[in-house]
């Protein structure tokens, strides 16, 4: 659009159709030329008695911002736009006021006005600029950091997006995007955007805000991914019914409406366009999400963004396909689904669907949780995720939950993208009516993912009630147990079985109390024999205060429904036999370990047996296979090179959030029992 006061006078023109649509993270040149018939400029403006004055502004609903002013060959740029805007052709071509804008972000959308004043003459032209596209963090269904470079791209493509570029992530960061999760980008680098640096998220920038980078990585390494969804012509719509839909029913319902299940990318675009739904729905990748554009406490914890409902409290796993939610459909024809076999697979081969049940609850509800960082246990890893150096971030692991004991129950937790920086990068709704404790004891950062189970020998509490048929305390050990798959995955029944399988029994409240009094601390809620759920805290800290505020003690959630899922506390008395450590040059796969122990008239030791052996003085600085497929090692005399500064049985996990059993084909030492 162009205007001038009258013919034959100053005229300004932007020869581009409006609106101009440009991609997030790209650069933009808006041509602006002016003709000044009264004062043709034939020499540099500085020689003219009255030089024209050029002013560029951006106008949005909220305000008008002057970007720069130029006159007499000098350009004064608004300090907030110092490295962002320029006049590339001025003053070399004095009548060319073309504006260049670098690294466009969503906030750069608006009406741009090129205004030229010369004496009493004044003329302007405008152009609407729409910055299109959104960057979002994407994690595979199974767990964190599972995508190699190929799979990362595939994940984006299957969600109506492409892998984001560093420029796009930078632009999203400048728009306020904050995510403490390392993700692939198109140039094969791995980065993550941090506004509020904190331990675990410092990366290569220490305490300075900015996009962290690990540089170019080997394509076989695994991380999450940052995707970029450009635009869509169709529409995202919600389908609902009183009884909601299973995943299959949701897909059918969308088809019935002449649509199909929307992808995560399409939902992000709809959210960016203002979509706001306080109800979670199925998407094409079997995830369950909901878009929040108007912050309110009872819908996603007062935060903006696309929220995600996860299966587990550590924000991994998608809900059981038979659980019921709304259906989120997409009506457009502008996306053509890429068949699964075009990525060389018949489906997500790295997915395990784990099913849990939880009460039928209204979603979403307000329980805020903040993910903490990797500041919990001493950590070593079986499968290095990246070169661990002092600055290698361990974004968001383990998750810490801010306790609010009296809040209602929900199974939604958070998502990634929020429109604004947050004090903690991701907040979501927790999965229980109290603060779920974080992982246990702080310890020095190591180079692999081991959990430090600080285990203590138990002595009897005076006057503690005898439990019929239960081994008494002296000489026994209470230990926290978690199956390899995930945190908080055991029903009461499964918890009892798990202890029995490890050669132990489920601990009683008295045994846990005795262990606590002997110094045992574990910030993980676990079943006890009386169907209560408790955890012992010697040094209270925010995510572990439970029902005791800042006082030390055994926290309790009271008697819980047996279908709820937690970890478990087991008790092992004395060892009836011996645990021995075996190694060889090429070490053993899990299967080979089983066979080897059998060939030596023994069995693979159980977790309980290893704890009992540790209690009797077994000290080995090498992790070995146990009968449940876990990898552990007993430390009696702590030393810096062997799992930290406390005695205990260390567990080696596959993932930094302390879940996942090692690959049975990986090779390790062995603990046998005879």
């Amino acid at each position: 659009e162009e205007t001038s006061d009258h013919d034959n006078s100053l005229s300004v023109s932007i020869p581009e159709p409006s609106p101009m649509r440009v991609l997030l993270g790209s650069s933009l040149t808006i041509p602006c030329y002016f003709i000044d018939p009264m004062h043709p400029v034939t020499t540099a403006p500085s020689t003219a008695p009255l030089a024209p004055r050029i002013k560029w502004s951006r106008i949005t609903k909220e305000k008008e911002v002057v970007l720069l002013v130029a006159t007499e060959g000098q350009v004064r740029i608004n300090s907030a736009y110092q490295d962002k805007v320029s006049l590339p052709n001025y003053p070399a071509i004095p009548s060319d006021a073309t504006l260049e804008i670098q690294n466009l972000r969503s906030n750069d959308s608006g009406i741009y006005r090129c205004e030229v004043m010369h004496g009493i003459e004044d003329s302007e032209a405008t152009l609407e600029v729409v910055v299109k596209g959104i960057v979002f963090h994407y994690r595979a269904i199974s767990t964190r950091y599972t995508l190699d470079f190929d799979r990362a791209q595939r994940a984006c493509l299957q969600n109506s997006a492409i892998i984001a570029t560093p420029e796009q992530l930078q632009a999203a960061y400048e728009d306020g995007f904050h995510q403490c999760d390392a993700g692939w980008l198109a140039d094969q680098t791995v980065r993550y955007p941090i506004h509020t640096p904190r331990e675990g998220c410092y990366g290569d920038k220490d305490e300075f805000p900015g996009v962290r980078t690990y540089g170019i990585r080997d394509t076989n390494e695994t991380y999450d991914v940052y995707c970029f969804a450009e635009e869509m012509e169709g529409e995202v719509l919600y389908a609902t019914s009183p009884e909601k839909f299973t995943f299959q029913e949701a897909a059918n319902e969308c088809r019935r409406l002449g649509a199909r299940l929307a992808t995560t990318g399409q939902l992000y675009l709809a959210w960016q366009g203002g979509m706001d739904m306080c109800s979670a729905g199925w998407l094409a990748d079997r995830s369950v999400r909901y878009p929040i554009s108007k912050a309110r406490p009872n819908c996603g914890g007062n935060l903006l963004g696309v929220r995600t409902v996860y299966l587990h409290a550590n924000q991994t796993g998608y809900p059981d396909p038979s659980s019921r939610y709304d259906a989120i459909c997409y009506t457009g024809e502008d996306f053509v689904d890429i068949p699964e076999n075009f990525f060389g697979v018949g489906g997500e081969e790295d997915i395990t669907i784990q099913t849990v049940t939880w009460p039928d609850v209204e979603l979403p509800l307000p329980r805020n949780i903040t993910e903490g960082e990797a500041r919990g246990n001493v950590i070593l890893t079986v499968k290095p995720i990246f070169d661990l150096s002092p600055t290698a971030p361990e974004p968001e692991e383990p998750f810490t939950f801010v306790p609010e004991p009296e809040k209602p129950f929900t199974f939604a937790t958070d998502v990634g993208v929020t429109a604004f920086p947050e004090a903690e990068n991701r907040t979501g709704e927790a999965t229980r009516p109290w603060g779920v404790p974080e992982e246990s004891t702080p310890g020095p950062a190591f180079t692999a993912f081991t959990s430090e189970d600080h285990v203590v020998q138990v002595t009897a509490v005076p006057g503690a009630a005898e439990v019929p048929g239960q081994p008494r305390l002296p000489g026994g050990v209470v230990f926290h147990y978690r199956p390899g798959s995930a945190r908080y995955s055991l029903t009461f029944e499964e918890a009892q079985q798990a202890c029995l399988r490890t050669g132990a029994v489920i601990a009683s409240p008295e045994q846990l109390q005795a262990a606590y009094e002997a110094g045992y601390e574990q910030c993980d809620a676990g079943w006890l024999q009386d169907q209560t759920v408790r955890y012992p805290i010697v040094s209270p800290r925010t995510p572990c205060v439970g029902d005791k505020d800042s006082s030390p003690g055994v926290r309790t959630y009271g008697v819980r429904p047996p279908s709820e899922t937690y970890d478990v506390y087991c008790y092992v008395d004395k060892l009836e036999g011996e645990v021995f450590f075996i190694t060889r040059l090429e070490q053993f796969t899990f299967q080979e370990a089983l066979a080897f122990c059998e060939s030596h008239n023994a069995t693979l030791a159980s977790t309980g047996q290893l704890y009992a052996a540790w209690r009797q003085g077994l000290d080995k600085c090498y992790a070995g296979w146990l009968s449940d497929g876990s990898l552990r090692y007993p430390i009696v005399t702590p030393r810096p090179s062997c799992g930290g500064d406390k005695p205990g049985v260390r567990t080696v996990y596959l993932y930094p959030n302390q879940t996942g059993l090692p690959d049975p084909l990986s090779r390790h030492h062995v603990f046998c029992f005879r």
Epitope: F149, Q153, L157, I162, I163, A186, E230, E233, D334, I338
Partner: nanobody, 115 residues
Framework: EVQLVESGGGLVQPGGSLRLSCSAS????????MFWVRQAPGKDYEWVAS????????YYDDSVKGRFTISRDSAKNTLYLEMNNLKPEDTALYFC????????WGQGTQVTVSS
């Protein structure tokens, strides 16, 4: 600005061969999966072949397996589709794509297989 420009189409007899090219610009070609998609008159889009960013993995629709070969030259930012033993049912408009969003594809190049 992202641009994909296909070329190499034409009229060919059954059993003949063609080599399609797609010149890419405006994005990190070497870091992108790439695809060939086709649309026969009055039919839906059909994914023909895909290649990962390194060129180490290729996948084909069953209807073209053994006859078509997808490849890439990252130094030249170019994607190729070598088509041998062409059949009349291969007649279609062939598009080079880097995403499932139709609006981001090239204009296409016409392949007609007819005697």
């Amino acid at each position: 600005e992202v641009q994909l420009v296909e070329s190499g189409g034409g009229l060919v007899q059954p059993g003949g061969s063609l080599r399609l090219s797609c010149s890419a610009s405006g994005f990190t070609f070497s870091g992108s999966w790439m695809f060939w998609v086709r649309q026969a008159p009055g039919k839906d889009y059909e994914w023909v072949a895909s290649i990962n960013s390194s060129g180490g993995r290729t996948y084909y629709d069953d209807s073209v397996k053994g006859r078509f070969t997808i490849s890439r030259d990252s130094a030249k930012n170019t994607l190729y589709l070598e088509m041998n033993n062409l059949k009349p049912e291969d007649t279609a408009l062939y598009f080079c794509a880097r995403s499932p969003r139709v609006g981001s594809w090239g204009q296409g190049t016409q392949v007609t297989v007819s005697s």
